[in-house]
């Protein structure tokens, strides 16, 4: 089978601090040494890129400094964390994996993780 399968959890609940983490696992059909991982957000059939990182197998993922994502890799598994989430960011987050080098190129796209974000209630003023 030449197609690449990507697995990710169906649902994740963000923490009260607006942080959501999930694992993106891919079944590699090739011996890739350079992998690109992209997180996409799908809302109302519109797809936008949230963040992306390219890494060498065995090394850590490096997202851009201003990225809302961080992550670690272990074999064919990537642990992704998205921070700074608010209720309006609730949506389907898709893990896209590309085996970039050596050729041939392979693409794998997960079914998406529905991330629910609930804004924390403001603390009521208290009298002491």
């Amino acid at each position: 089978c030449k197609a690449m399968h990507v697995a990710q959890p169906a649902v994740v609940l963000a923490s009260s601090r607006g942080i959501a983490s999930f694992v993106c696992e891919y079944a590699s059909p090739g011996k890739a040494t350079e992998v690109r991982v992209t997180v996409l957000r799908q809302a109302d059939s519109q797809v936008t890129e949230v963040c992306a990182a390219t890494y060498m197998m065995g090394n850590e993922l490096t997202f851009l400094d201003d990225s809302i994502c961080t992550g670690t890799s272990s074999g064919n598994q990537v642990n992704l964390t998205i921070q700074g989430l608010r209720a309006m960011d609730t949506g389907l987050y898709i893990c896209k994996v590309e085996l970039m080098y050596p050729p041939p190129y392979y693409l794998g796209i997960g079914n998406g993780t529905q991330i629910y974000v609930i804004d924390p209630e403001p603390c009521p003023d208290s009298d002491f």
């Epitope: 030449k2 797809v47 936008t48 050729p103 041939p104 796209i109």
Partner: antibody
Framework: EVQLVESGGGLVKPGGSLRLSCAAS????????MNWVRQAPGKGLEWVSS????????YYADSVKGRFTISRDNAKNTLYLQMNSLRAEDTAVYYC???????????WGQGTMVTVSS | EIVLTQSPATLSLSPGERATLSCRAS??????LAWYQQKPGQAPRLLIY???NRATGIPARFSGSGSGTDFTLTISSLEPEDFAVYYC?????????FGPGTKVDIK
């Protein structure tokens, strides 16, 4: 408006060279991988080459490997295809196409005709 | 290289009829399959990606189905502007390959 416009096609003799250009507008060119696809007269579509957003990764069809070179200039929002050692079988309309975020070729140019004949 | 086979080569139908086009891959492409429409003298236009997702602006009469090696593009009721050539493409691995096309013409 999202647009791709190819140029540089023409008539060239076998063994000759040609450089095609594809000018992009209406989107952040530097964020997308790009492709060249060709179509011989009356025939189907054939993928030629692909280049990643930062030019780090390049792929070619076996039929053009060693003869064609894909490149891009993100500052100029332009994709290129340098074609050397041209053969009669390279005669085709050449299209540039953008790779959408989900993988398919979502935006295509109108094409430029390349004719290789003596 | 993944080889895509399309059938039939030509489909002769009348406006209002249902068109069913088939695409078969030589090995599994999962759901990394797209359908394109091409009219004479024009560039291809993306219709369907991910085997079943309509691209932006594509009418609901176009639908795609299938996964693995067998795929179908259905046009529920042909409009005059739908008579064209349709190509399937796999984009899951390089080299990216296209099927030979199915021509839908007016009976």
């Amino acid at each position: 408006e999202v647009q791709l416009v190819e140029s540089g096609g023409g008539l060239v003799k076998p063994g000759g060279s040609l450089r095609l250009s594809c000018a992009a507008s209406g989107f952040t060119f530097s964020s997308y991988s790009m492709n060249w696809v060709r179509q011989a007269p009356g025939k189907g579509l054939e993928w030629v080459s692909s280049i990643s957003s930062s030019s780090s990764y390049i792929y070619y069809a076996d039929s053009v490997k060693g003869r064609f070179t894909i490149s891009r200039d993100n500052a100029k929002n332009t994709l290129y295809l340098q074609m050397n050692s041209l053969r009669a079988e390279d005669t085709a309309v050449y299209y540039c196409a953008r790779v959408g975020l989900m993988g398919p070729f979502d935006i295509w140019g109108q094409g430029t005709m390349v004719t290789v004949s003596s | 290289e993944i080889v895509l086979t399309q059938s039939p080569a030509t489909l002769s139908l009348s406006p209002g009829e249902r068109a069913t086009l088939s695409c078969r891959a030589s090995q599994s492409v999962s759901s990394y399959l797209a359908w394109y429409q091409q009219k004479p003298g024009q560039a291809p236009r993306l219709l369907i990606y991910g085997a079943s997702n309509r691209a932006t602006g594509i009418p609901a009469r176009f639908s795609g189905s299938g996964s693995g090696t067998d795929f179908t593009l259905t046009i529920s009721s042909l409009e005059p502007e739908d008579f064209a050539v349709y190509y399937c493409q796999q984009y899951g691995s390089s080299p990216f390959t296209f099927g030979p096309g199915t021509k839908v013409d007016i009976k």
